[in-house]
Amino acid sequence: QPDAINAPVTCCYNFTNRKISVQRLASYRRITSSKCPKEAVIFKTIVAKEICADPKQKWVQDSMDHLDKQTQTPKT
């Protein structure tokens, strides 16, 4: 049984300066841990690269909306 108390926490210390095309994005996850200095979004690209982004930025929010909507559309 893994010890959740000692589980490593992923944090973002810097955000990307560049807007990423939604066509390059595969998924995201939110960093909301109080152990991290900043609230953040980690986008995973279609080539499995992870990029930290600022959830306050509109392009980040729009990209999360786009990815959310994709999850309710059956992939054919």
Epitope: S27, Y28, R29, R30, T32, E39, V41, P55, K56, V60, Q61, D62, M64, D65, L67, D68, K69, T71, Q72
Partner: nanobody, 123 residues
């Protein structure tokens, strides 16, 4: 951490209307997908409606489509659920939730939940 407080519930006759509000405090409201869920006695919590961060897209369960409208005001950190043509089967505790993880209508993708507000529709 996001705190959510619902209001606007109450007792209403069938065919009536109610408007629920959910006020958020804490982290950036506009960075969360917002949803409404409900739980009737002896039943599972069920999805009602969701709205995107921008507010441009909404999605409803089949049971409320055409009767309920979800909206949000990012300047006021508030999400609303306008409920019209209410039916006795709409009786439930209604919960507001903030979705931080990728998803849409699945409760498991919502990280933050309010305490709920009771809606009772009498026949």
């Amino acid at each position: 951490e996001v705190q959510l407080v619902e209001s606007g519930g109450g007792l209403v006759q069938a065919g009536g209307s109610l408007r629920l509000s959910c006020a958020a405090s804490g982290r950036t409201f506009s960075s969360y997908r917002m949803g409404w869920f409900r739980q009737a006695p002896e039943k599972e919590r069920e999805f009602v409606a969701v709205i995107t961060r921008s507010g441009s897209d909404q999605f409803y369960s089949n049971s409320v489509k055409g009767r309920f409208t979800i909206s949000r005001d990012n300047a006021k950190n508030t999400v609303y659920l306008q409920m019209n043509s209410l039916k006795p089967e709409d009786t439930a505790v209604y919960y507001c939730a903030a979705g931080a993880q990728i998803g849409w209508a699945e409760a498991s993708t919502y990280d933050y939940w309010g305490q709920g507000t009771q809606v009772t529709v009498s026949s």
